[in-house]
């Protein structure tokens, strides 16, 4: 009879045992051990024992022990059972970001382990179980299907195998994959909302807008705003679920045109957009032309007013004939037309808008100089020793210098408050003068004394 | 005892296709995947890809994607490598092996190849 | 891909001598949960290659003790302690821890 112990053996991969093998027999023929592992015997008193050490045990093995005794020949066999935690534990890769509401699957691989009777694979998320299975196939998998909510939010998902071996009177082996950091997060169905100008002209700045709500985390959200090939650089303001980005455009002539204005709004893997045509346009003030803006009084006058060609002027609240970027008119100047101003007004419609623009023009009439009876009186009398204002208004353009003298000499203190006396009395030259010319006019200052009252 | 047996020597004209088998004995089939592994003549050893004999899934190089083709029969227990539209450049030994699917405990035991001649 | 670079190409060695092949990674072989997967190979005239050495130490079933592994990350070494007729081959060491697996181009081992 042969015995071999241990009878059951658990070794970890490339380990070594001590296999010992009896014979009931006192003087067996034969006495040893059949396997493909390394052998190495131990020597022992005694015919009727060996003990074997069997080293780099790889795989489950069963090495046989076997005797050769009168009574005949026998067998026993030891089973070696390997064990070896998985070499690798893994979450099949996944998108960091989850759309909450959508069904995530997570799969588990495990590579390698044995024996697999005891290898458990366990999904979690943090430290809660989701599903536990045996280790079947190579490699190993196990799945399952999680729909995300927004509490998942950074929750750590991982896997987990266990190698329990405690049965054997061994410990529990664990091995636990990489993390997998859920990141969830809500993106509305509807798109950003965008506020901005419909037209706008070339070397002006406008404001645009673009808003949305809903956002889940809103933190994360990433804002684009572009018009055509400009990105713009908005100010974004962050409420609970809502943002806002706000943000300057600058338009020059290369803009010119339609362009899109662009708001797309990036969260997780998912984005929403909103796109806006604006209509880049240039309109210059219409321009006002005077043949002169400065002529002498009966010169004949020629106003233009010349606008963009897609607009229609009115000069002086008279609309173009016929309606266009063109409008004149024709005019002798007369002194009352000095300082007339002539306005031209342009509207061009852009995208549906009118667009208004104006510009005015003055007329300078050189007229004169001009001494009236009406603003310069021939004929004086105050009583003596009584407080007078003597006047005289000339008139023209540019204004004249006026100058009163008696005898050439004797000035009339025009525009001063003076005591009458004798000496006033007399005849003054008033003379007018301008780059328009000269006029003189005779004023008479008669002085009423009261002795002859 | 583990044994991979694979088909016998193939000629082939390119743009032909070729189907190898590697019959597995002597193991729990599924516990292990197959890969395969190409020798030309004055080249190193290629591999070409793997499959899960449990599942079914591969996972192939990149280089070889699109014309090879590895599948299984669990109930034969057996593991084929197709490989289309041959050219000259891929005459060599195609070999069968053993390993984790991930290979992380190396191939430990191999098919004993199959010749493939690709000529006109 | 990774690329594997042994050195001799061929190694000739008296025998009961010692012999020693290096191999050289082109990048990192440790793989992110610390493990390193280079594997050596000795291949038989007319025969498939024969796992020697897996996860850079470890003997496989059946290798005799004077075969052994070492080195970490790029640089890897397969020792021969003395050399007997029947390790004659060409030698190859492996990767499995980048996508794809690679090989290296082999040491041809021969008695001197």
């Known amino acids: 009879q042969t015995s071999v112990s241990p009878s059951k053996v658990i070794l970890p991969r490339g380990g070594s045992v001590l296999v010992t093998c009896s014979t009931s027999c006192d003087q067996p023929k034969l006495l040893g051990i059949e396997t493909p592992l390394p052998k190495k015997e131990l020597l022992l008193p005694g015919n009727n024992r060996k003990v074997y050490e069997l080293s780099n045990v790889q795989e489950d093995s069963q090495p046989m022990c076997y005797s050769n005794c009168p009574d005949g020949q026998s067998t026993a066999k030891t089973f070696l059972t390997v064990y070896w935690t998985p070499e690798r534990v893994e979450l099949a890769p996944l998108p960091s970001w989850q759309p909450v509401g959508k069904n995530l699957t997570l799969r588990c691989q495990v590579e390698g382990g044995a024996p697999r009777a005891n290898l458990t694979v366990v999904l979690l998320r943090g430290e809660k179980e989701l599903k536990r299975e045996p280790a079947v196939g190579e490699p190993a998998e196990v799945t399952t299907t999680v729909l995300v909510r927004r509490d998942h939010h950074g929750a750590n998902f991982s896997c987990r195998t266990e190698l329990d071996l405690r049965p054997q009177g061994l410990e529990l082996f664990e091995n636990t994959s990489a993390p997998y950091q859920l990141q969830t997060f809500v993106l509305p169905a509807t798109p950003p909302q965008l506020v901005s100008p419909r037209v706008l002209e070339v070397d002006t700045q406008g404001t645009v807008v673009c808003s949305l709500d809903g956002l889940f985390p809103v933190s994360e959200a990433q804002v684009h705003l572009a018009l055509g090939d400009q990105r713009l650089n908005p100010t974004v303001t962050y409420g609970n679920d809502s943002f806002s980005a706000k943000a300057s455009v600058s338009v020059t002539a290369e803009d010119e045109g339609t362009q899109r204005l662009t708001c797309a709004v990036i969260l997780g893997n998912q984005s929403q957009e909103t796109l806006q045509t604006v209509t880049i346009y240039s309109f210059p003030a219409p321009n006002v032309i005077l043949t002169k803006p400065e002529v002498s009084e009966g010169t004949e006058v020629t106003v233009k007013c010349e606008a963009h060609p897609r607009a229609k002027v009115t000069l002086n609240g008279v609309p173009a004939q016929p309606l266009g970027p063109r409008a004149q008119l024709l005019l002798k100047a007369t002194p009352e037309d000095n300082g007339r101003s002539f306005s031209c007004s342009a509207t061009l419609e852009v995208a549906g808008q009118l667009i208004h623009k104006n510009q005015t023009r003055e007329l300078r009439v050189l007229y004169g100089p001009r001494l009236d009876e009406r603003d310069c009186p021939g004929n004086w009398t105050w009583p003596e020793n009584s407080q007078q204002t003597p006047m005289c208004q000339a008139w023209g353009n540019p204004l004249p210098e006026l100058k009163c003298l008696k005898d050439g000499t004797f000035p009339l203190p025009i525009g001063e408050s003076v005591t009458v006396t004798r000496d006033l009395e007399g005849t003054y030259l008033c003379r007018a003068r301008s780059t328009q010319g000269e006029v003189t006019r005779k004023v008479t200052v008669n002085v009423l004394s009261p002795r002859y009252e | 005892q583990v044994q991979l047996v694979q088909s016998g020597a193939e000629v082939k004209k390119p743009g032909a296709s070729v189907k190898i088998s590697c019959k597995a004995s002597?193991?729990?089939?599924?516990?292990?995947?197959l890969h395969w592994v190409r020798q030309a003549p004055g080249q190193r050893l290629e591999w070409m890809g793997v499959?899960?004999?449990?599942?079914?899934?591969?996972d192939y190089n990149q280089k070889f994607r699109g014309r090879v083709t590895i599948t299984v029969d669990k109930s034969a227990t057996t593991a084929y490598m197709e490989l289309s539209s041959l050219r000259s450049e891929d005459t060599a030994v195609y070999y069968c092996?053993?390993?984790?699917?991930?290979?992380?405990?190396?191939?430990?035991?191999w098919g004993q190849g199959t010749a493939l001649t690709v000529s006109s | 891909d990774v690329v594997l670079t042994q050195t001799p190409l061929s190694s000739p060695v008296t025998l009961g001598q010692p012999a020693s092949i290096s191999c050289r990674s082109s990048?990192?072989?440790?793989?992110?949960?610390?493990?390193?997967?280079l594997h050596w190979y000795l291949q038989r005239a007319g025969q498939p290659p024969r796992l020697l050495i897996y996860?850079?130490?470890n003997r496989f079933s059946g290798v005799p003790d004077r075969f052994s592994g070492s080195g970490a990350g790029t640089d890897f070494t397969l020792k021969i302690s003395r050399v007997e007729a029947e390790d004659v081959g060409v030698y190859f060491c492996s990767q499995n821890t980048h996508f794809p697996y690679t090989f290296g181009g082999g040491t041809k081992l021969e008695i001197k």
């Open positions: 996860k850079v130490s």
């Open positions: 002597g193991y729990t089939f599924t516990d292990y995947a």
């Open positions: 092996a053993r390993s984790l699917y991930f290979g992380s405990s190396g191939f430990d035991y």
């Open positions: 990048q990192t072989l440790v793989y992110r949960n610390g493990n390193t997967y």
């Open positions: 499959i899960s004999t449990y599942s079914g899934n591969t």
